[in-house]
Interface confidence: low
């Protein structure tokens, strides 16, 4: 799904930091200002504006040191591996003054039998092996250290954990003569946490386990286990929280049922059912106890596992998630959509909204998209006037220093943000739609008309007259 969305309102780029002074010569000592803003309350917006201004004015003083890159560290414990037996690892960018740690789990579907794992190894080796991983990665979105791009947690220690286990971060089986592939997703997370304790995580105040897509589901499956691990290792004071992006899937009825042949057409329940056996998958203990043996697959679905979790979790989910539609065998090609499909899509949004009803910390825009938090322009989308970084900040505030979310929402600082309008892109801040196959940008109005929506209904929230909308449709403007 990389590069499939246009995020910033076009033509608008963040202003570059002012460069009014020369940067220090290489090797010249530079003072560091370790700052941590975990405890700041009150007028956060005004405070953040001042901090941004300070950060940008200090930029020329440390241009040499302002390296956005996260550096690769392969696990020292080489028995914890990717699918092909190569060592797993993580990318790290430390922020020594901060006691916040962000651990991000990458996404990228899964494979659940020898045949489709072989195919994945041929076509997407990076997701099964560390052999060709680059030495550095750039932190983007919530992993960015630039306050302009990441007004939420720019000062945190950033960790990107590449996905190379193909098991939705749930596996606990090593490569052997019997097993062609290792599936060690759950163990990789545990081992990364263990190694990071020696790199400063031991002094953390907050550990935010985040992830997108399969990584988002991975958060739901692992967040409580990480909290337990830290407790057992003697770090009960570290607050563990979860941020699950685009990993809250429904085990709904497919639009068109297909046999379970490959990853994408296999109904999610069946794929996970097979996967758990193949991966020796583990699920959160409290969830597992709610289901009979052989029914652990239920715990991969957000609305079933969430009520059993102890750690606070913030759920980010597009109401019309492209991956959800894909597994439901909905392929929007720009061809006119039958009434039945339109109703199916609308119903999907309605069902998803319903599953988030009792999730106090959630952000669900009515858009057709997939993943958001490590997109550079993750700040652009809003639900009812609130952006995701703002909602996350409000969530931080609502948690205070306790592990439990406070029941009373902070005035003017909402954390439950779920769009109520009923069709894709009725939210004016949605990212641009692209045709799934051609990659061409699609005009929203055109897209909605193809989906069979009534002109007046569609035109109004776009701030248009039906006649204008008709004109737009005829040329895709």
């Amino acid at each position: 799904s990389e590069g499939r969305k246009t995020w910033r309102r076009r033509g608008q780029q963040p202003p570059p930091p002012p460069r009014t002074e020369a940067a220090p010569a290489a090797g010249q000592p530079v003072e560091s200002f370790p700052l941590d803003f975990t405890a700041v309350e009150g007028n956060m917006d005004s405070f953040m504006a001042q901090v941004k201004s300070l950060a940008q004015s200090l930029y020329p003083c440390s241009a040499q040191q302002l390296n956005e890159d996260l550096r690769l560290h392969l696990l020292l414990n080489t028995s914890v591996t990717c699918n092909d037996g190569s060592p797993a690892g993580y990318y790290l960018k430390e922020s020594r003054g901060s006691r916040r740690w962000l651990l991000f789990l990458e996404g990228g579907w899964y494979c659940f039998n020898r045949e489709n794992c072989d195919s994945r190894y041929d076509t997407m080796r990076r997701l099964m092996s560390s052999r060709d991983w680059p030495r550095t990665r750039t932190g983007t979105g919530i992993l960015s250290s630039q306050p302009e791009e990441n007004p939420y947690w720019w000062n945190a220690n950033m960790v990107f954990i590449p996905y190379c286990s193909s098991d939705v971060w749930s596996g606990a089986s090593s490569k052997s003569e019997k097993n062609e592939y290792a599936f060690m997703g759950a163990l990789i997370i545990q081992e990364v946490v263990r190694e990071l304790l020696g790199r400063g995580l031991s002094g953390a105040k907050v550990l935010l386990l985040a992830g997108s897509s399969a990584g988002g589901t991975g958060v739901l499956l692992n967040v409580d286990r990480v909290a337990e691990q830290l407790e057992k290792l003697g770090y009960p004071a570290i607050q563990v929280r979860g941020l699950a992006d685009s990993g809250w899937f429904l085990d709904n009825k497919q639009y068109r049922h297909t046999d379970c042949v490959d990853t994408i057409t296999c109904a999610p329940t069946e794929a996970i059912r097979r996967g758990i056996r193949y991966w020796n998958g583990v699920v959160p203990e409290r969830c597992r106890r709610q289901f009979q043996e052989g029914e652990e697959w239920n715990c991969f679905f957000g609305y079933k596992v969430y009520p059993t979790l102890r750690c606070p979790v913030f759920v980010v989910q597009w109401l019309f998630d492209e991956a959800q539609l894909t597994v439901d065998n909905v392929h929007l090609t720009g061809q006119p959509v039958q009434e039945g499909l339109r109703l199916y899509i609308q119903n999907l949004g309605r069902e998803l909204r319903h599953t988030l009803k009792d999730v106090p910390a959630s952000f669900a825009p009515a858009c057709l998209s997939h993943e958001i938090i490590i997109r550079s322009h993750w700040t652009d989308v809003q639900v009812k006037g609130t952006s995701l970084p703002r909602a996350l900040h409000c969530w931080d505030r609502s948690l205070h220093d306790s592990h439990k979310a406070s029941k009373t929402p902070l005035k003017g600082c909402p954390v439950h943000l779920v769009d109520s309008c009923p069709w894709p892109h009725c939210n004016p801040s949605c990212p641009t739609v692209r045709d799934q196959f051609t990659g061409q940008e699609m005009n929203v109005a055109q897209f909605l008309m193809h989906m069979g929506f009534d002109m007046q209904t569609v035109a109004q929230p776009q701030g248009l007259e039906p006649s204008e909308l008709l004109g737009m449709l005829s040329n895709g403007s």
Epitope: G385, C421, Q460, P461, E465, L470, M472, S474
Partner: antibody
Framework: EVQLVESGGDLVKPGGSLKLSCAAS????????MHWLRQAPEKGLEWVAY????????SYANTMKGRFTISRDNAKKTLSLQMTSLRSEDTAIYYC????????????WGTGTTVTVSS | DIVLTQSPASLVVSLGQRATISCRAS??????????MHWYQQKPGQPPKLLIY???NLESGVPARFSGSGSGTDFTLNIHPVEEGDATTYYC?????????FGSGTKLEIK
């Protein structure tokens, strides 16, 4: 740099005609709906006309319908406003502005060109 | 057409204090949780500059001293703390349907 620059403003007699132009740069002009707006001396802002990105939708303020014609050339990145049967009340600074995708606000404005209608 | 009534027509505020400008629409400019009201600042001899879009969103590069709120028919622009350079004219604009219309403007003076 995203920029809009108007030209063509002049002193013209009542009943006369004038063509204003707006040159765009720094963004993909063909992706955006464009507007003309105006401001009479010491007065507020008034919307004049709108053209969708592909020129299929044209819309005008009631007092300008039939007298003004909005057009665009995406290849040349230019927006035009042909004004005929001009009246003294058309005296104003004319601005071209870009309509933002997500909600119909004007996120980029030109510097304006002055049209004076007087005998 | 939707008529926007802006008030007050002029406003005098002390340096460092809060300036509040109101804009009332003749019919609702909100739909499905979104409010199609925007605010601009116009300095003499210059074109208007977008400050706030969709009622409460700060345009990139605009200081956080500016904020917008409201929904339905009643909207507010707040400036706090007011600075010398804020002394100029402010307009609200809706884009709920064509034609877009503007308020008559509020002239802010700093004392």
């Amino acid at each position: 740099e995203v920029q809009l620059v108007e030209s063509g403003g002049d002193l013209v007699k009542p009943g006369g005609s004038l063509k204003l132009s707006c040159a765009a740069s720094g963004f993909t002009f063909s992706d955006y709906g464009m507007h003309w707006l105006r401001q009479a001396p010491e007065k507020g802002l008034e919307w004049v006309a709108y053209i969708s990105s592909g020129s299929t939708t044209l819309s005008y303020a009631n007092t300008m319908k039939g007298r003004f014609t909005i057009s665009r050339d995406n290849a040349k990145k230019t927006l035009s406003l042909q004004m005929t049967s001009l009246r003294s009340e058309d005296t104003a600074i004319y601005y071209c502005a870009r309509k933002n995708y997500n909600g119909g606000y004007f996120d980029v404005w030109g510097t304006g060109t002055t049209v004076t209608v007087s005998s | 057409d939707i008529v926007l009534t802006q008030s007050p027509a002029s406003l005098v505020v002390s340096l460092g204090q809060r300036a509040t400008i109101s804009c009332r629409a003749s019919k609702s400019v909100s739909e499905s949780g979104y409010s199609y009201m925007h605010w601009y600042q116009q300095k003499p001899g210059q074109p208007p500059k977008l400050l706030i879009y969709l009622a409460s969103n700060l345009e990139s590069g605009v200081p956080a001293r500016f904020s917008g709120s409201g929904s339905g028919t009643d909207f507010t622009l707040n400036i706090h703390p007011v600075e010398e350079g804020d002394a100029t004219t402010y307009y609200c604009q809706h884009s709920r349907v064509l034609p877009p219309t503007f308020g008559s403007g509020t002239k802010l003076e700093i004392k």
